[in-house]
């Protein structure tokens, strides 16, 4: 049987072509440094497509290797505040389950007002992933300077 | 039937194999913000498999979600002249047809001289995805500090 | 037959799913640039999946267009060493065989203490990636600040 | 040639709000920070805030308490400032100003003479 | 806030002469430092950006000195145009900062 016919019969899923782009809802409440994000078509050109959310956090449903990527661009953003408010950094993490807690990605602003980086990491079923953002500075909601996905790449 | 064969025995496009990675070959006249991309073997190590260009723009030619990625450095550039040249922004975007206009990715230079980003997006057969660079800096032609690219990632 | 069915049946590296995740094991000696990196599940999160290291550098063993990806973070560094000890600069390219020999991507710190970025390119077995930091200034060893990958996309 | 044009003067009660608008041509809106600038009669200049057009971000002068909004809308290109529970002192000029990854500030509206008097 | 301390308040030259104001910073603020004319019944109008940089159009006898804490505007040669208030600013921090001001005036 053609793959291409296969492709069209069997659930995506059960491809493993899990895959996710969120973009920002709010951030947490004072002494909560987490940005909650929201996804849906509904939304504008985010999608959940195997992963959920969990109160604003990403939980990952399939077992594998992902690529995680970010972009978190600060909303009111100069010479000023780059520098003096340092540090604000980003930091993108596994928070639960507890036992498997561990910062995956962190970038610092410095003297910019974006950050954008990615990465291959292992990811089990029912992690979830946490964005921490440390420092004074909110950041933007725009869904083109402000997103965060992840994408099944491989068992 | 195993897959393996299965790949040999259909071409890639039927796999949803779309991907390109573009060089940057001129910036545009005056009143123009857009870049001017080009790829091929011939011109390096830029391609295209399935997406085409059209007068210097990427089109799509697959439905599916799509990882964009871009990276684009000024030709000559410090830290001062990228903030005293302010405001020096990149955005992404599906500049055609019309109707789905829109702003996918959006950097500005501030204090740095080079930007790179990546993030998923839905995209349909018939997109054509324009970069601009407003501002008054010229970006940097080489082929390992300029560049655009897109992956099919899933339908 | 299902997909699914011979996903499980075949070995993955036929299915052309070769992927690397590396940490920063250390710099080199006086007058080389070169990172050297250091992947295992035993050393944490990174892996390598098909592509092999070769005294510390990454050895690809399957041809095709891959997404290569990097950031690294400057140990101790702020927007002002990071402009006084101008340029640091990071390049990613084919450092054998010579007759390959090119750089894959470059990007200067100058006001930013983390540089990241990815592009896909063709590569093919035999290739060996070099990542090579020029400047005074040394990278941090965190496997959340400083990593460097590759991920096959397609033949 | 880039301009910003300022809605015109205003007399206000103590405790009312007046809302001046600053229209702007000649430059992409979304691609400057707008920035509003106070002046008492005879005295000097008082920052009060900023916003970035593009995403709605605004930064503000702790010395106006929360009675100072900053808005933009980025269909008419026109940026505006609020000021609620007006007081004598709050009689100035007002000015917007616009400004980039450093915050000095190149081109200035004409000035709003805002008047509270009872 | 960062106070930015103007002096003198008032400043009495003759066309053709130099004039030197001066602005003190409470805290360092490197380069962060601007500033601007004004004369009665007018918005300010950018002279100097980054503590020494003349804005476009600005005539080459305004001069700018810095940086840290002590920030000098020199006026070469006084012009009949040249008698206003000029205010520094400082944008190192915020809240944005401006100087009492320096009233230039025909001696």
């Known amino acids: 049987q053609r793959f291409a016919q296969a492709q069209q019969q069997l659930p995506l899923e059960s491809l493993g072509w899990d895959v996710a782009e969120l973009q920002l809802n709010h951030t947490g409440p004072q002494q909560d440094p987490r940005l909650y994000w929201q996804g849906g078509p509904a939304l504008g050109r985010s999608f959940l497509h195997g992963p959920e959310l969990d109160k604003g956090q990403l939980r990952i449903h399939r077992d594998g290797i992902y690529m995680v990527h970010i972009q978190v661009t600060l909303a009111i953003c100069s010479s000023t505040t780059a520098s003096r408010h340092h540090p604000t950094t980003l930091a993108v993490g596994i928070c639960s389950p507890a036992s498997r807690s561990i910062s995956l990605l962190r970038l610092s602003f410095h003297q910019g007002c974006t950050i954008a980086s990615q990465r291959l990491t292992p990811l089990a079923r029912g992690d979830t992933l946490c964005t921490n953002l440390t420092g004074t500075l909110l950041p933007s909601r725009n869904t083109d300077e402000t997103f965060f996905g992840v994408q099944w790449v491989r068992p | 039937q195993r897959f393996a064969q299965a790949q040999q025995q259909l071409p890639l496009e039927s796999l949803g194999w779309d991907v390109a990675e573009l060089q940057l070959n001129h910036t545009g006249p005056q009143q123009d913000p857009r870049l001017y991309w080009q790829g091929g073997p011939a011109l390096g190590r830029s391609f295209l498999h399935g997406p085409e260009l059209d007068k210097g723009q990427l089109r799509i030619h697959r439905d599916g979600i799509y990882m964009v990625h871009i990276q684009v450095t000024l030709a000559i550039c410090s830290s001062t002249t990228a903030s005293r040249h302010h405001p020096t922004t990149l955005a992404v975007g599906i500049c055609s047809p019309a109707s789905r206009s829109i702003s996918l990715l959006r950097l500005s230079f501030h204090q740095g001289c080079t930007i790179a980003s990546q993030r998923l997006t839905p995209l349909a057969r018939g997109d054509t995805l324009c970069t601009n660079l407003t501002g008054t800096l010229l970006p940097s032609r080489n082929t390992d500090e300029t560049f655009f690219g897109v992956q099919w990632v899933r339908p | 037959q299902r997909f699914a069915q011979a996903q499980q049946q075949l070995p993955l590296e036929s299915l052309g799913w070769d992927v690397a995740e590396l940490q920063l094991n250390h710099t080199g000696p006086q007058q080389d640039p070169r990172l050297y990196w250091q992947g295992g599940p035993a050393l944490g999160r990174s892996f390598l999946h098909g592509p092999e290291l070769d005294k510390g550098q990454l050895r690809i063993h399957r041809d095709g267009i891959y997404m290569v990806h990097i950031q690294v973070t400057l140990a101790i560094c702020s927007s002002t060493t990071a402009s006084r000890h101008h340029p640091t600069t990071l390049a990613v390219g084919i450092c054998s065989p010579a007759s390959r020999s090119i750089s894959l991507l470059r990007l200067s710190f100058h006001q930013g203490c983390t540089i990241a970025s990815q592009r896909l390119t063709p590569l093919a077995r035999g290739d060996t990636l070099c990542t090579n930091l020029t400047g005074t200034l040394l990278p941090s060893r965190n496997t959340d600040e400083t990593f460097f990958g590759v991920q096959w996309v397609r033949p | 040639e880039v301009q910003l044009v300022q809605s015109g003067a205003e007399v206000k009660k103590p405790g009312a709000t007046v809302k001046i608008s600053c229209k702007v041509s000649?430059?992409?809106?979304?691609?400057?920070?707008m920035n509003w600038v106070q002046q008492a009669p005879g005295k000097g200049l008082e920052w009060m805030g900023i916003i970035n057009p593009y995403n709605g971000g605004t930064h503000y002068n702790q010395k106006f308490k929360g009675r100072v909004t900053i808005t933009a809308d980025t269909s008419t290109d026109t940026a505006y400032m609020e000021l609620s529970s007006l007081r004598s002192e709050d009689t100035a000029v007002y000015y917007c100003?616009?400004?980039?990854?450093?915050?000095?500030?190149?081109?200035w509206g004409q000035g709003t003479l805002v008047t509270v008097s009872s | 806030e960062i106070v930015m301390t103007q002096s003198p308040a008032t400043l009495s030259v003759s066309p053709g002469e130099r004039a030197t104001l001066s602005c003190k910073a409470s805290?360092?603020?490197?380069?962060?430092v601007a500033w601007y004319q004004q004369k009665p019944g007018q918005a300010p109008r950018l002279l100097i950006y980054s503590a020494f940089n003349r804005y476009n159009g600005i005539p080459a006898r305004f001069s700018g000195s810095g940086p840290g804490t002590d920030f000098t505007l020199t006026i070469s040669s006084l012009q009949s145009e040249d008698f206003a208030v000029y205010y520094c600013?400082?944008?190192?921090?915020?809240?944005?900062?401006f100087g009492g001001g320096t009233k230039v005036e025909i001696k």
């Open positions: 100003a616009t400004s980039g990854y450093d915050l000095y500030f190149d081109y």
């Open positions: 000649g430059y992409t809106f979304t691609d400057y920070y």
């Open positions: 600013q400082q944008y190192s921090t915020y809240p944005l900062t």
């Open positions: 805290q360092n603020v490197g380069t962060a």
